[in-house]
């Protein structure tokens, strides 16, 4: 039978479609961004020089479940998913296409987790075995933040992932955490 | 390629439960939320409900206890638990911008 | 539950004008807010959500603005292909008390 939905109180946002969490859209070889895929703007010229405070890093709240295995957790957790542009993408020709949002000889601003908060939950699993607790990290707040060509790859894997569009009607994979990381994952279904 | 198709609208009589299934293609239901949507003839949009991917089901004041909300991986169904003339209209789904062609359910004696 | 309320239920204007759609939530739904246009005998077609992301393909001549309670759609440019009923609709979080999902009453454009 598999399990029931959690009734309670906590609000629920409902991805539909092609809506709701929405990555930037990929870039093809030879494109400017879509006007249409931003909001109707047209895309700012790569190397244009804006102040921050012109961009909006905002924080949309998510209700989620926390699921170990075929445990899931007795109420959803509220986390924060960090959405907008900081700053014109600074892009160059060989990078174009390949989801690298960066501009390695300039500086940039991402719209990414800026603190995180720990969250106790206890999981419920099915056939009577016994609730399990765990611990999870949760964004607490975003924050537009600078990039310099010193950061390396792996760093800007972690604020660049939100740049692959997921496959239209499948379901976003969450992204990979490291070992450290909670074994429990958020599943994303608000 | 995704698709949304609603079935199941016919005539009924007054207090007649009847159910509408809305079937989907290329869509993950455990994932997305897929919403009901009516409109009465010359008449505007009315949101009925919608279910989420994990199965949690909101309806507006006006249609708690009238309809009920259910799945499966690939369809989800709509039930009218007692129609009444009120109810004639043209049924949706939707999810984003995926809206099934609707689907006619007359009420009458 | 989430209440829209959508000005004018009509307007007409000219080709090559410009309509300005209201649409008021009875409560802050953020930027949780949807345009449809809808033709008569047609499912209605989505144009905005997140309050002012146009969905792929609709022309930029479509603009929406407003984030809490207030929001407005702009149409610059009438074309008659543009003649159709407009509505607003909220899919703001819901819990088993309140639903954030409704339509505004739908704006009819009358172009001349």
């Known amino acids: 039978q598999g399990w029931q939905a959690f009734k309670n109180d906590a609000t629920e946002i409902i991805p539909e479609l092609g809506e709701y969490p929405e990555p930037p859209p990929e870039l093809e070889n030879n494109k400017t961004m879509n006007r249409a895929e931003n909001g109707g703007r047209p895309p700012h010229h790569p190397f244009e020089t804006k102040d921050v405070s012109e961009y909006s890093c905002r924080e949309l709240h998510f209700t989620r479940y926390v699921t170990d295995g075929p445990c899931r957790s007795a109420k959803p957790v509220t986390e924060l998913v960090c959405s907008g542009q900081c700053g014109p993408a600074r892009l160059l020709p060989n990078a174009i296409g390949r989801g690298k949002w960066w501009r390695p000889s300039g500086p940039d601003f991402r719209c990414i987790p800026d603190r995180y908060r720990a969250q106790r939950v206890q999981l419920l699993c099915p056939g009577g075995e016994a609730p399990r607790a765990r611990k999870v990290r949760l964004v607490a707040s975003c924050k537009c933040k600078r990039l310099t060509r010193f950061h390396n790859q792996s760093e800007l894997k972690d604020f660049g992932t939100e740049a692959a569009r997921p496959q239209k009607g499948r379901k976003p994979r969450p992204r990979a955490r490291s070992a450290k990381a909670n074994q429990a994952e958020l599943e994303n279904a608000y | 390629c995704q698709s949304v198709e609603e079935s199941g609208g016919r005539l009924v009589t007054p207090g007649t439960p009847l159910t509408l299934t809305c079937t989907v293609s290329g869509i993950d239901l455990s994932y997305y939320g897929m919403g009901w949507v009516r409109q009465a003839p010359g008449k505007g949009l009315e949101y009925i409900g919608i279910i989420s991917g994990i199965g949690n089901t909101y309806y507006p004041t006006w249609a708690k206890g009238r309809f009920t909300i259910s799945k499966t991986p690939t369809t989800v169904d709509l039930r009218i638990t007692s129609p009444t003339t009120e109810d004639t209209a043209t049924y949706f789904c939707?999810?984003?911008?995926?809206w099934g062609p609707g689907t006619l359910v007359t009420v009458s004696s | 539950d989430v209440v829209m309320t959508q000005t004018p239920a009509s307007v007409e204007a000219a080709v090559g004008g410009t309509v300005t759609i209201k649409c008021q939530a009875s409560q802050s739904i953020s930027t949780y807010l949807k345009w449809y246009q809808q033709k008569p005998g047609q499912r209605p077609k989505r144009l905005i959500y997140?309050?002012?992301t146009l969905t792929s393909g609709v022309p930029s001549r479509f603009k929406g603005s407003g984030s809490g309670t207030d929001f407005t759609l702009t149409i610059s440019d009438l074309e008659c292909g543009d003649a159709a009923t407009y509505y607003c609709?909220?899919?703001?979080?819901?819990?088993?008390?309140?639903?954030?999902?409704?339509f505004g009453g739908g704006t009819e454009v009358v172009v001349k």
């Open positions: 939707a999810t984003g911008d995926f």
């Open positions: 997140s309050a002012s």
């Open positions: 609709q909220s899919n703001a979080g819901s819990s088993s008390s309140s639903c954030g999902y409704a």
